[in-house]
Interface confidence: low
Amino acid sequence: HQDKVPCKMVDKKVSCQVLGLLQVPSVLPPDTETLDLSGNQLRSILASPLGFYTALRHLDLSTNEISFLQPGAFQALTHLEHLSLAHNRLAMATALSAGGLGPLPRVTSLDLSGNSLYSGLLERLLGEAPSLHTLSLAENSLTRLTRHTFRDMPALEQLDLHSNVLMDIEDGAFEGLPRLTHLNLSRNSLTCISDFSLQQLRVLDLSCNSIEAFQTASQPQAEFQLTWLDLRENKLLHFPDLAALPRLIYLNLSNNLIRLPTGPPQDSKGIHAPSEGWSALPLSAPSGNASGRPLSQLLNLDLSYNEIELIPDSFLEHLTSLCFLNLSRNCLRTFEARRLGSLPCLMLLDLSHNALETLELGARALGSLRTLLLQGNALRDLPPYTFANLASLQRLNLQGNRVSPCGGPDEPGPSGCVAFSGITSLRSLSLVDNEIELLRAGAFLHTPLTELDLSSNPGLEVATGALGGLEASLEVLALQGNGLMVLQVDLPCFICLKRLNLAENRLSHLPAWTQAVSLEVLDLRNNSFSLLPGSAMGGLETSLRRLYLQGNPLSCCGNGWLAAQLHQGRVDVDATQDLICRFSSQEEVSLSHVRPEDCEKGGLKNINL
């Protein structure tokens, strides 16, 4: 009579997900090892029939309406290793009437998230769990943790407490968890970490609290193992004192209120002068710290969305392993990395959306930098070789600045221009919205760009040969919104070009693509095209996938190539229903509705169709 149970059974795994069940089925194979009953309407868990399935190792009871656990309900499940009771109603009194979950001798992972559990009640629910490695209490209503909260679980390694309302963690709350390595306390209501002393902890997530200060315990010989610390979305006013955490690899401090000090520390003894924010800086290590160089192993530092106005030299000095530094959305007016060997491993530097006016990058600094994001600043008169000095630079975003590109080596630009030629590593460059008036010949010579965006520079004049040297490398070119009437670019020579954006100009002619090229997407929206003759477009037929044409004064006749694309569909032309064309009488119709005979009236024979 097993066929009466609508569960799916494969080997020793049984899935009864979302079947509207009101109770645990009693007719499943007794040797079932994995049982998924999630998403049903179970209200109580009784020792019978659950106790029949003594071979169970995995039991998922999540997303039900469980408010009653019969004492000893799990007692017979002596092999049980993974138990999920997430998203039920265990906070209701009947769930805890006698002994809660009871002992769980072999359970290694237990999920009690989303049960509205509150402090005090939790202690009654948790029983002895000597093998427990992973415990989730996320999305509950816990307000405090005491010494008694986590007793009898000596093997616990991972503890998830995110999305509670924790305001208070009693001293010694985690003392009974000697193996704890991962602790998630994000999305709580903590205001201060004044005595962090969990030496064995490796990962600590404190994001989305209201923390104003983070201080490690003052144990001179302490060897903290912490490698990953997330403090984003808090209320830190200063860079925390992390000198006791020499193994930190990942540090996220974004979305705080951090300012870095602008002068030397008032207190010459070291790192404790809170008035100036120097408690904030990892300038010297405590005497007992073996490495002697705090943050020397840090790979990833996120300081975005803070209130930093200046980066002191001493701050960058110790970050010798740093690969990723995010300083976007701060108040920086200047950034300097001039010293030989400054940030030697840095691969990505995000300085976007600050108020940068000056940028000084030394000839041998930032030797590993691949990505530099500078969009949304006020950069204007930069030293000409600012970017040419960056030996590994591959991607550069300068959108929304006021940078003027120099010409090629034989075509020097005006004072204050920046050289973009001869940067042999550079692949992607955005100069969108820089008020560039003239793009000089040879501007990108010996810089094998694959992507170049010059959009939103109204009035831009592209000199003959301005894109010279890019013919064999360029794959994406955008010249949108520049008011161009003619294009001084021999497009068919760009043999690798896949995407071309010429929208929002005043173009009426394109060069003839007579031989097959690589172009896949062509955006000609809002220009002045009336004809796209087959003689010019023929070479695109094999490669072109999408063509954007709305907002052009297209002629209904003489556009046979375009009509053929609409009907045969080799090229996906946008909005085919609404692509409007005009007859000489100024009558407007949908181009897809034009018939050959419409163009023969009055001698308007459509020779291309």
Partner: antibody, heavy 120, light 107 residues
Framework: QVQLRESGPGLVQPSQTLSLTCTVS????????VSWVRQPPEKGLEWIAT???????YYNSALKSRLSISRDTSKSQVFLKMSTLQTEDTAMYFC??????????????WGQGASVTVSS | DIQMTQSPASLSGSLGETVTIQCQAS??????LAWYQQKPGKSPQLLIY???SLQDGVPSRFSGGGSGTHYSLKISSMQTEDEGVYFC?????????FGSGTKLEIK
């Protein structure tokens, strides 16, 4: 910072013409498209029209015969005229900036809306 | 015109819960989908563009996904301030079209 502000009459007689103005600051109309979108009481959003950064115009085909969108770049203003108003044109009218380059039209900043009631 | 079908029309979720809203386009929109949130008496706010890119300043509990004609908005660990109406919009081509909206309430 980027802002858009709609202004208009509030109350319009049936069969009359509605004139709305969207005044923008923090960006240039020659760099970004601007759209008009409306929302009748307790209903969803309906796109009305867009004027592109190059001055091109796009209209909702169901309303096109009654619409006109224009702009004055020197005053940073976009105008919408809608003729022959009926009671079903009662709605909150928003103007919004369209962001980004590429092939997607996304409204990243919206005005607070102008309430328009069509009633005699 | 591209039709956008949004579901469900209304949805209630508990604090901390994960909720998902679906949006289906009548044709392939090549990830040209945006999601907006609107609170009573306020204008819509952009949450997600390009199907999965988070707009600056939007909390990371919001995420978007999908391709072709099927897209979704997921809110993990729902907060009180997430109550409101959510709209999808295709931004591939004119006429721009919106989904009918999903009203999200706290249980």
């Amino acid at each position: 910072q980027v802002q858009l502000r709609e202004s208009g009459p509030g109350l319009v007689q049936p069969s009359q013409t509605l004139s709305l103005t969207c005044t923008v600051s923090g960006f240039s109309l020659t760099s970004f498209h601007v759209s008009w979108v409306r929302q009748p009481p307790e209903k969803g959003l309906e796109w009305i029209a867009t004027i592109s950064s190059g001055g091109g115009t796009y209209y909702n085909s169901a309303l096109k015969s009654r619409l006109s969108i224009s702009r004055d770049t020197s005053k940073s203003q976009v105008f919408l005229k809608m003729s022959t108003l009926q009671t079903e044109d009662t709605a909150m009218y928003f103007c919004a900036r369209i962001s980004g380059w590429g092939h997607y039209y996304v409204m990243d900043v919206w005005g607070q809306g102008a309430s328009v009631t069509v009633s005699s | 015109d591209i039709q956008m079908t949004q579901s469900p029309a209304s949805l209630s979720g508990s604090l901390g819960e994960t909720v998902t809203i679906q949006c289906q386009a009548s044709e392939d929109i090549y990830s040209g989908l945006a999601w907006y949130q609107q609170k009573p008496g306020k204008s819509p706010q952009l949450l997600i563009y390009g199907a999965g890119s988070l707009q600056d300043g939007v909390p990371s509990r919001f995420s978007g996904g999908g391709s072709g004609t099927h897209y979704s908005l997921k809110i993990s660990s729902m907060q009180t301030e997430d109550e409101g109406v959510y709209f999808c919009q295709q931004g591939l081509k004119f006429p721009l079209t919106f989904g009918s909206g999903t009203k999200l309430e706290i249980k």
